[in-house]
């Protein structure tokens, strides 16, 4: 899937009312110095790229964070102003179901949600030169 | 689909290193997450390093630091440098690609890494 075709001023709006509110309320009681983070992403389809592998996907130390508000609202987003996004989802949403379990916040997962926000605000700037 | 080919692992004494590749053919590598496992005697497979396609990279505590996971996706590889290798190291090595977004996941078959003096 490509996301080429999104409308990246809408998702935008939908990050800064109410995605953004959500990551910050999941990283709340961690200092925002805690994370060194590095993350980058050239331009708005490759951030949503890299967003939707962070997001739905798991990574060492974080199993999932597919259930968490961020990320259904996140979810959500894309298919309304993401052309055929939905249609790609069918096999992941099946396999969620299957898997139920008990929601645990790591250190991992919070790096990881951090990470989150840096594409998300590299998302925001897209005129911004690479650093 | 893509398939795996994992290569590079030996035996090594305590202290040394190693690299691991995974080769990959067929479509889809490029926007994949991928993943090296291991997999120790009478231990469940553990996920401990991850790499998403713009490269940003995670890692449990018991690899960080020493052990490197990097991509080459004009070259469809993907590497594992392991620094200061530890008896504990030891075990069966998978790579493994997963699309982000039916999180289909393809497999390796496995490389051998024994740490021992």
């Known amino acids: 899937y490509d996301f080429t075709n999104c409308d990246f001023e809408k998702i935008k709006a939908a990050y800064l009312s109410t995605i953004s509110k959500d990551l910050i309320t999941y990283m709340s009681g961690t200092k925002s110095t805690e994370f060194n983070n590095t993350v980058s992403c050239s331009n708005r389809p490759h951030c949503l790229t890299e967003i939707q592998s962070l997001t739905f996907n798991p990574t060492a130390g974080c199993a999932s964070l597919a259930k968490e508000m961020f990320a259904m609202k996140t979810k959500a987003a894309l298919a309304i102003w993401c052309p055929g996004y939905s249609e790609t989802q069918i096999n992941a949403t099946q396999a969620m179901k299957k898997r139920r379990k008990r929601k645990v916040t790591t250190n991992k997962c919070l790096e990881q949600v951090s990470q989150l926000q840096g594409l998300w605000r590299r998302f925001n700037r897209p005129l911004l030169k690479q650093q | 689909e893509v398939q795996l080919v994992e290569s590079g692992g030996g035996l090594v004494q305590p202290g040394g290193s190693l690299r691991l590749s995974c080769a990959a053919s067929?479509?889809?590598?490029?926007?994949?997450?991928l993943y090296w496992y291991r997999q120790a005697a009478g231990i469940e497979r553990e996920l401990i390093a991850s790499i998403t396609s713009g490269g940003i990279t995670n890692y449990v505590d018991s690899v960080k630091g020493r052990f490197t996971i990097s991509r080459d996706n004009s070259e469809n590889t993907m590497y594992l440098q392991m620094n200061s290798l530890r008896a504990e190291d030891t075990g069966v090595y998978y790579c493994?690609?997963?699309?982000?977004?039916?999180?289909?996941?393809?497999w390796g078959q496995g490389t051998l890494v024994t740490v021992s003096s």
């Open positions: 493994a690609s997963r699309n982000i977004f039916d999180g289909t996941t393809e």
């Open positions: 067929g479509s889809g590598f490029g926007v994949n997450i």
